[in-house]
Interface confidence: medium
Amino acid sequence: MRKTRLWGLLWMLFVSELRAATKLTEEKYELKEGQTLDVKCDYTLEKFASSQKAWQIIRDGEMPKTLACTERPSKNSHPVQVGRIILEDYHDHGLLRVRMVNLQVEDSGLYQCVIYQPPKEPHMLFDRIRLVVTKGFSGTPGSNENSTQNVYKIPPTTTKALCPLYTSPRTVTQAPPKSTADVSTPDSEINLTNVTDIIRVPVFNIVILLAGGFLSKSLVFSVLFAVTLRSFVP
């Protein structure tokens, strides 16, 4: 009984240590149904210009799911549309533009831009975007404030690209590129974003964890490993 409690305690210490070591930033966007999310994901121009890029959603406790991706190799400024998602890769500027038009409440969730680089794992472009879509009128006639560009017209020449099947929750430890977004809608008072609601998101990554390299309290790891090992020894 005491051994089980100790084991549980060590796991808790281990997990909390891991959570502290693998925090990712997340920014929150609050939009209304019918509005458009318009996100810019920056990437290193020289490294990733022609790499295939994707827009993913991360549902609680699940692997990231790819919703749309660019062609392979990625074509410059060539829109790719998958349903209500439009991707455009601007090679000259090192940025991927992602638009989600006519947002629905069920679109709420955590999103990220990634770069596919097989056979390696996808490279995540930080930060993640916490999208909150609420019900409400997004375009009241005669409203007192309007965006000068109210409606996103879906480009006529869009392509649907085939995305790789694999997804990965693995994080990347290098310095994160930034992402920026603009919202353009027919709202009377257009809620741009709650851009500054930055939440620190712990990412539980057992792969990096077992590599063991970046835990500051290596003692916790060692003791936990020893206890775990002992519990398997007859």
Epitope: E27, Y29, D38, V39, K40, D42, Y90, H93, L95, R97, D127, I129, E145, S147, T148, Q149, K178, S179, T180, A181, D182, V183, S184, D187, E189, I190, N191, L192, T193, N194, V195, T196, D197, I198
Partner: antibody
């Protein structure tokens, strides 16, 4: 670091138009957000609108709708603000400002400003 | 449009004083607020963004706080070069709006 240089002072007649330019150098103009802000003599700051050159996306205050046109020329890294049907109350210093830090939303905080262009509307 | 009300509209202070300027939004704007400093005949200068983040190159005597509807800019120890007009600006929703300004004068 991006620098913004604006066109010179203008004196205009009521009912005419003025076009102010804002040339960027030393940074990523296309993916910056360029705002236009004006300040009447002895008054506060007033946001007129903005543009993201790479996307051509513009947003503006209703107060100026139908009178202001904001454009950008990526090839010369220059943004323009044209204000038509001028009246005496449009006499002000017009500033262009860029948001180059960037973090999701384009008009996050205007961290680079032009020197200002004085527009005087007088008959 | 979201209205920003700054107070006081002007204040007199001495070098070394602690100065506090407040900015109240007509509705919640999360932390989507910036503070600017403007000197006569000059363009505004960004001091604080995201309500409390100090813009690079800005002295640490400047600090911002608040969230929702009430925000504060504090100058911990006023220096001669700090005599200027200060503006708050929200970027939570279009149109972007500025406060009316607070003029900090020498006592």
């Amino acid at each position: 670091q991006v620098q913004l240089v604006q066109s010179g002072a203008e004196v205009k007649r009521p009912g005419s138009s003025v076009k102010v330019s804002c040339k960027a150098s030393g940074g990523t103009f296309s993916s910056s957000a360029i705002s236009w802000v004006r300040q009447a003599p002895g008054q506060g700051l007033e946001w007129m609108g903005g543009i993201i050159p790479i996307f051509g996306t513009t947003n503006g205050a209703q107060k100026f709708q139908g009178r202001v046109t904001i454009t950008a020329d990526e090839s010369t890294s220059t943004a323009y603000m044209e204000l038509s049907s001028l009246r005496s109350e449009d006499t002000a210093v017009y500033y262009c400002a860029a948001m180059v830090r960037g973090n999701y939303f384009y008009f996050y905080g205007m961290d680079v400003w032009g020197q200002g262009t004085t527009v005087t509307v007088s008959s | 449009a979201i209205q920003l009300t700054q107070s006081p509209s002007s204040l007199s202070a001495s070098v070394g004083d602690r100065v506090t300027i407040t900015c109240r939004a007509s509705q919640g704007i999360s932390s989507a607020l910036a503070w600017y400093q403007q000197k006569p005949g000059k363009a505004p200068k960004l001091l604080i963004y995201a309500a409390s983040s100090l813009q690079s190159g800005v002295p640490s005597r400047f600090s911002g706080s608040g969230s929702g509807t009430d925000f504060t800019l504090t100058i911990s120890s006023l220096q001669p070069e700090d005599f200027a007009t200060y503006y708050c600006q929200q970027y939570n929703s279009y149109p972007l709006t500025f406060g009316g300004g607070t003029k900090v004068e020498i006592k």
